[in-house]
């Protein structure tokens, strides 16, 4: 039985050229997290954090994705094309798979502020 919930940073905005932290948190379960996969809106993988082998940044993103904090991901040098959905997939034992969603809007405006608040999607 899957008792856990994924909390995410929800809908966030950030400035073009800036950086943003994508963060998910799994709570209300004692399940062991074996791996966390981070995917972009087109389902391409950005990064994997394996519990035993550590972080693995995909080649296409190696110059502008930084691991962390924690199981989160920092996306740097943002472009307008980065606007869209991001998904964290928690592979756990024995529960199975949990998935969280974040929507990132990259803004041209210099007054755009990075807003981040945890919410349950």
């Amino acid at each position: 039985m899957m008792t856990g919930t994924i909390e995410t940073t929800g809908n966030i905005s950030a400035k073009k050229g800036g950086s943003v932290i994508l963060q998910c948190h799994l709570s209300s379960t004692m399940a062991q997290v074996t791996q966390v996969n981070w995917e972009q809106h087109d389902h391409s993988l950005l990064a994997i954090r394996n519990a035993e082998l550590g972080w693995h940044i995909y080649p296409a993103f190696k110059d502008r994705v930084a691991p962390g904090p924690g199981l989160g991901l920092t996306l740097q040098s943002l472009t307008m094309n980065d606007t869209g959905e991001y998904f964290c997939t928690y592979h756990t034992y024995p529960d199975g798979t949990y998935r969280g969603r974040i929507f990132l809007e990259v803004l041209e405006s210099s007054v755009a502020e990075h807003s981040a608040r945890f919410q349950i999607p």
Partner: antibody, heavy 123, light 109 residues
Framework: QVQLQESGPGLVKPSQTLSLTCTVS??????????WGWIRQPPGKGLEWIGS???????YYNPSLKSRVTISVDTSKNQFSLKLSSVTAADTAVYYC???????????????WGQGTMVTVSS | EIVLTQSPGTLSLSPGERATLSCRAS???????LAWYQQKPGQAPRLLIY???SRATGIPDRFSGSGSGTDFTLTISRLEPEDFAVYYC??????????FGGGTKVEIK
């Protein structure tokens, strides 16, 4: 489709270093989800995993061989290599390279293999 | 390390018969991490089954895998002449390290 090809000397003297290279064709070693591994098989015996490497250089090794093993990657040549130091006759085996799906979780396996290369350790 | 014990060591059967191969682990293995391979003389191993029960691409449906915990089974429902080979199970954990079983030879009776 992805193919792997081992290359290197077929004869190595005791106490020397065994060096092999695996060339990946039909796909990029920077595929992202895969590690790339080495497995060996002494004549008439079973399979023994040696170690595996990610395109970024991250590795994991068989603890029983770790002190003698170095696996490296050259993404510009789409190759990865094995070095095994201080070899003895017990290291005589067919050496295979293979694609390692350790990060695929429910598909963890070696799904593509090279044809293998026989390495004999003898003076 | 996790020791995988395969039995029997040799299985003598005729074409058309059913083959049942066993792989027993010294400690529990996630079924997601258990694979089976076929190896013919002078050839590299070929992946048959991953995740204990999923057939790899191009593998005929006469091959099936099952099991969980410490006991896993590879079944060949009706042996074809090309199925006579050595079969290895493998567990793909990182710590303890991944290991292969000692193999089961399926030979023509």
């Amino acid at each position: 489709q992805v193919q792997l090809q081992e290359s290197g000397p077929g004869l190595v003297k005791p106490s020397q270093t065994l060096s092999l290279t695996c060339t990946v064709s039909g796909g990029s070693i920077e595929s992202g989800v895969y590690y790339w591994g080495w497995i060996r098989q002494p004549p008439g015996k079973g399979l023994e995993w040696i170690g595996s490497i990610y395109y970024s250089g991250s590795t994991y090794y068989n603890p029983s061989l770790k002190s003698r093993v170095t696996i490296s990657v050259d993404t510009s040549k789409n190759q990865f290599s094995l070095k095994l130091s201080s070899v003895t006759a017990a290291d005589t085996a067919v050496y295979y390279c293979a694609r390692d799906g350790v990060l695929t979780l429910n598909k963890r396996s070696f799904d593509i293999w090279g044809q293998g290369t026989m390495v004999t350790v003898s003076s | 390390e996790i020791v995988l014990t395969q039995s029997p060591g040799t299985l003598s059967l005729s074409p058309g018969e059913r083959a049942t191969l066993s792989c027993r682990a010294s400690q529990s293995v996630s079924s997601s991490y258990l694979a089976w391979y076929q190896q013919k003389p002078g050839q590299a191993p070929r992946l048959l089954i991953y995740g204990a029960s999923s057939r790899a691409t191009g593998i005929p449906d006469r091959f099936s895998g099952s099991g969980s915990g410490t006991d896993f089974t590879l079944t060949i429902s009706r042996l074809e002449p090309e199925d006579f080979a050595v079969y290895y199970c493998q567990q793909h954990t990182v710590r303890p390290p991944l290991t292969f079983g000692g193999g089961t030879k399926v030979e023509i009776k």
